[in-house]
């Protein structure tokens, strides 16, 4: 840009140097040159001379008009054509910006990752504003009425040390730029309800050599939360559809989960957990790939055969990835195992 230019005159912008994208804009240039009665005044945008919509107002001043200006940034300067001078003479320059007022922040979510010592709040910022936009996060205790504010650009981490006064808070976010301000909806937060258990990790898997081979997946977490509900999803690497198994877990010991899988196939497993009865999930764990052993007998493989069904009651769901680029956005077709056949349930989003 041209923020430190020595002007021999003035340049100003109506409605202002930062304005709403798509507005009509007038830029004025007024010369105050010594020993020059300019024949012409010229405007340049980003170094290129402008040809249209220029009006000479009087001897010293000219205006250029833009209909529906839609560039996020431009630098403007103007020059004079002085008699007897070979080159144009610089008068002044200005950086101009256009943008949008912020959208109201949406989908405000606050979680405490176990052992992190922080409450992390995130939100959707909406459409790009193209100009400097700040987010002010308000955290108000519902017990003491004390309010704290934090400045953020896209998310905020608030030390739980500064949230010692109470357990219940009201959280909201203001989006602010020079074109406007919008508030998110307020979020009621109880600190005990937003803890996400420490990461769950699949440590190993093995397939037994039994008549009906089974795969045992071992997984663990360092969580101190006693009641944890988990999901493990799995599929062959060639498949788009996930199956999901649900578990109540107690991480005082390593978890073992049994699966009856197709032989000689490469499977990928992932696990995620939440505190039982709460709504915030861990992200899915890193994919764990396991190759099942080759079939030794001649038994025909039936994915819904009885050995699978004869485990303790559980729900297995089938989940189809919408696209390989969005592994976390899934559509889930719940299917409860009953008499060896899948029974379709409702779609729900687990992404």
């Amino acid at each position: 840009g041209i923020t430190s230019i020595n002007c021999s005159g003035d340049m100003w912008v109506e409605p202002g140097e930062i304005f709403q994208m798509g507005m009509n804009v007038s830029i004025y240039c007024q010369e105050a040159l010594k020993h020059c009665r300019p024949r012409n005044l010229y405007f340049y945008k980003n170094g290129f001379k402008e040809e249209f919509d220029i009006t000479r107002i009087n001897r010293t001043t000219a205006r250029i008009w833009y209909k529906g200006f839609s560039e996020p940034h431009a630098y403007m300067h103007c020059t004079a054509e002085c008699p007897g001078h070979f080159q144009e003479t610089l008068i002044c320059g200005k950086d101009i910006s256009s943008g949008h007022p912020p959208d109201a922040p949406s989908n405000l979510t606050c979680v405490i990752y176990e052992y992190s010592g922080n409450m992390t709040c995130t939100w959707n910022t909406g459409k790009p504003t193209y100009i400097d936009t700040k987010y002010i996060v308000h955290v108000k205790s519902l017990e003491t009425e004390e309010e704290q504010q934090y400045l953020a650009s896209s998310y905020v981490k608030i030390s739980t040390d500064s949230l010692q006064g109470s357990r219940k808070y009201l959280v909201w976010v203001q989006a602010v730029n020079s074109l406007g301000m919008e508030n998110s909806q307020q979020l009621h937060v109880h600190l005990d309800d937003i803890v996400i258990p420490s990461a769950s990790i699949i440590s190993r898997a093995e397939t037994t050599n039994d008549t009906v081979p089974k795969t045992i997946v071992y997984w663990k977490s360092k969580t101190m939360i006693e009641k944890v509900f988990c999901e493990m999803r799995y599929k062959t690497t060639t498949n788009q559809t996930w199956s999901v198994k649900e578990f109540d877990a107690n991480f005082t010991y390593v978890q073992q989960s049994e699966f009856y899988l197709e032989p000689d196939s490469k499977y990928v497993f992932q696990v995620r957990c939440q505190e039982t009865g709460k709504r915030n999930w861990q992200p899915w764990s890193s994919p764990f790939v396991h190759q099942t052993s080759q079939e030794t007998g001649k038994r025909n493989w039936q994915p819904w055969s009885s050995p699978f069904v004869h485990q303790t009651s559980q729900t297995v769901s089938q989940v189809t990835a919408k696209s390989s680029h969005e592994p976390q956005k899934m559509e889930m077709l719940s299917a409860t195992i009953f008499r060896g056949h899948p029974a379709s349930g409702n779609h729900q989003d687990i992404g």
């Epitope: 100009i131 953020a152 905020v156 500064s162 020079s178």
Partner: nanobody, 116 residues
Framework: QVQLQESGGGSVQAGGSLRLSCAAS????????MGWYRQAPGKERDLVSM???????FYADSVKGRFTFSQENAKNTVYLQMNNLKPEDTAMYYC??????????WGQGTQVTVSS
């Protein structure tokens, strides 16, 4: 840690003017996003004006065209020129230093009372 001290408040008739000052001390002032806030009794502390990183200034709709935010870097001081004051501008006015990810630091505040 930044310390902030406001001054310039007082009582004024509707239509009058006041100029608030906020002097900052401390070595992290340069990283502050400075703002003026106000809090009426029983209400939240609301943002009135803030200096943005691109050199522009935010003004709340209720004060646009009447209030002007300025700063004097050499003195580590910011100002809020308030013209055409209205009774609804009555509040405690605070300046604040906000840095990304940190809790906003406030001054002690200065009272502005506008009578009709």
């Amino acid at each position: 840690q930044v310390q902030l001290q406001e001054s310039g408040g007082g009582s004024v008739q509707a239509g009058g003017s006041l100029r608030l000052s906020c002097a900052a001390s401390g070595d992290t002032y340069s990283s502050c996003t400075m703002g003026w806030y106000r809090q009426a009794p029983g209400k939240e502390r609301d943002l009135v004006s803030m200096l943005m990183g691109d050199g522009s200034t935010f003004y709340a709709d209720s004060v646009k065209g009447r209030f002007t935010f300025s700063q004097e870097n050499a003195k580590n001081t910011v100002y809020l020129q308030m013209n055409n004051l209205k009774p609804e501008d009555t509040a405690m006015y605070y300046c604040g230093c906000a840095t990304l990810g940190s809790r906003t630091i406030w001054g002690q505040g200065t009272q502005v009372t506008v009578s009709s």
